[in-house]
């Protein structure tokens, strides 16, 4: 499911519960996706020893995965709500091609991989409603994404395993950073 249980506005199972605010819904959605990533990481870590490798050992890769930096305004130091929100949405849009790559990369967690992908789309929609400056958000070029996807899928098995691990780790870190920032807003 792309939305955590009980999050659908049509859910009537708990009529006395206060409806979630926009911020609470976003917070819960990110935690839901992080749980999904955790399950996917379990499968990849069981298959290879890459999870034990230090970040330095895995740093040499050609992936241009979104990453938070000081200039993005999401850290405690130099925090800027609007700049940060733009970075979070832009970063999530950039991750979408990598989440597409993750589909069919899992045997026992195929549904989980799909749930992470769909939940991220929902999260982007939630965040776009919150953002004031939508013009500043650049959407990735579909043609560039298509060729990137083809290139990633053409890698040998070892590189595909490495790519899967790096995507999951980077996406987890990006979401954790985003959550810390959103909780300051």
């Amino acid at each position: 499911a792309p939305v955590p249980p009980g999050e659908d506005s049509k859910d009537v199972a708990a009529p006395h519960r206060q409806p979630l605010t926009s911020s609470e819904r976003i917070d819960k959605q990110i935690r839901y996706i992080l749980d999904g990533i955790s399950a996917l990481r379990k499968e990849t870590c069981n298959k290879s020893n890459m999870c034990e490798s230090s970040k330095e050992a895995l740093a040499e890769n050609n992936l241009n995965l979104p990453k938070m930096a000081e200039k993005d305004g999401c850290f405690q130091s130099g925090f800027n709500e609007e700049t940060c929100l733009v970075k979070i949405i832009t970063g999530l849009l950039e991750f979408e091609v990598y989440l597409e790559y993750l589909q069919n990369r899992f045997e026992s967690s195929e549904e989980q991989a799909r749930a992470v992908q769909m939940s991220t789309k929902v999260l982007i929609q939630f965040l776009q409603k919150k953002a004031k400056n939508l013009d500043a958000i650049t959407t990735p070029d579909p043609t560039t994404n298509a060729s990137l996807l083809t290139k990633l899928q053409a890698q040998n098995q070892w590189l595909q395993d490495m790519t899967t691990h790096l995507i999951l780790r980077s996406f987890k870190e990006f979401l954790q950073s985003s959550l810390r920032a959103l909780r300051q807003m």
């Epitope: 955790s38 330095e56 000081e70 925090f79 979401l175 810390r180 909780r183 300051q184």
Partner: antibody, heavy 117, light 110 residues
Framework: QSLEESGGRLVTPGTPLTLTCTAS????????VTWVRQAPGKGLEWIGI?????ETAYATSAIGRFTISKTSTTVDLKMTSLTAADTATYFC??????????????WGQGTLVTVSS | AIQMTQSPSSLSASVGDRVTITCQAS??????LSWYQQKPGKAPKLLIY???TLASGVPSRFSGSGSGTDFTLTISSLQPEDFATYYC????????????FGGGTKVEIK
């Protein structure tokens, strides 16, 4: 797996001091690291945390005076403008970074910093 | 800024007693709360995280409950090695806070 703090000593007020947290049996690059201090006979006081290589967060009292930095094997706590109120045992602790909430599941034994003239 | 208030600050109990310590957050922190045990001259030790999940190697006489703003640590049957100071810690947000920890509860022998 263990953590060890070093660098604690007797210093005079105003002297800068750097404490170092060293990991054994694992790489710090895969974890978040926090610093916590405890004045004699008092409770635990959270100082700050380093997440990745450059994201940090600090307690309001630590902002501007304390700086946390990280390499693959060590995490440093740089302290400036020290006063007698900074006299405490300083602990570093590891957060396994697997979840979104901060929790510290591996601690060093602490290093004592005494600020006195 | 989130503040953590722990009570009582100290209590006296006997071996075999049921002991309850409470912790209150100034705003909702979901279930993102941990409990630590500290003995004199030693580093703190993680007992419980996510409000109710027992850390590895922690005896089952320790339990945690709560969500939102109100949390409880319970020791069902106090053992001699349980006399120590206990701290709660919020892990919800470490930005713009004075302290992530509660003030502590010292459990002494009656």
């Amino acid at each position: 797996q263990s953590l060890e703090e070093s660098g604690g000593r007797l210093v005079t007020p105003g002297t800068p001091l750097t404490l170092t947290c060293t990991a054994s049996g694992f790489s710090l690059s895969n974890y978040y690291v926090t610093w916590v201090r405890q004045a004699p006979g008092k409770g635990l006081e959270w100082i700050g945390i380093i997440y990745g290589s450059d994201e940090t967060a600090y307690a309001t009292s630590a902002i501007g005076r304390f700086t946390i930095s990280k390499t693959s094997t060590t995490v440093d706590l740089k302290m400036t403008s020290l006063t007698a109120a900074d006299t405490a045992t300083y602990f570093c602790a590891r957060d396994d970074s697997s979840d979104w909430d901060a929790k510290f599941n591996l601690w060093g034994q602490g290093t004592l910093v005494t600020v006195s003239s | 800024a989130i503040q953590m208030t722990q009570s009582p600050s100290s209590l006296s109990a006997s071996v075999g007693d049921r002991v309850t310590i409470t912790c209150q957050a100034s705003q909702s922190i979901n279930n993102e709360l941990s409990w630590y045990q500290q003995k004199p001259g030693k580093a703190p030790k993680l007992l419980i995280y996510r409000a109710s999940t027992l850390a590895s190697g922690v005896p089952s006489r320790f339990s945690g409950s709560g969500s939102g703003t109100d949390f409880t640590l319970t020791i069902s049957s106090l053992q001699p090695e349980d006399f120590a100071t206990y701290y709660c810690q919020q892990g919800y947000s470490l930005r713009n806070i004075d302290n992530a920890f509660g003030g502590g509860t010292k459990v002494e022998i009656k």
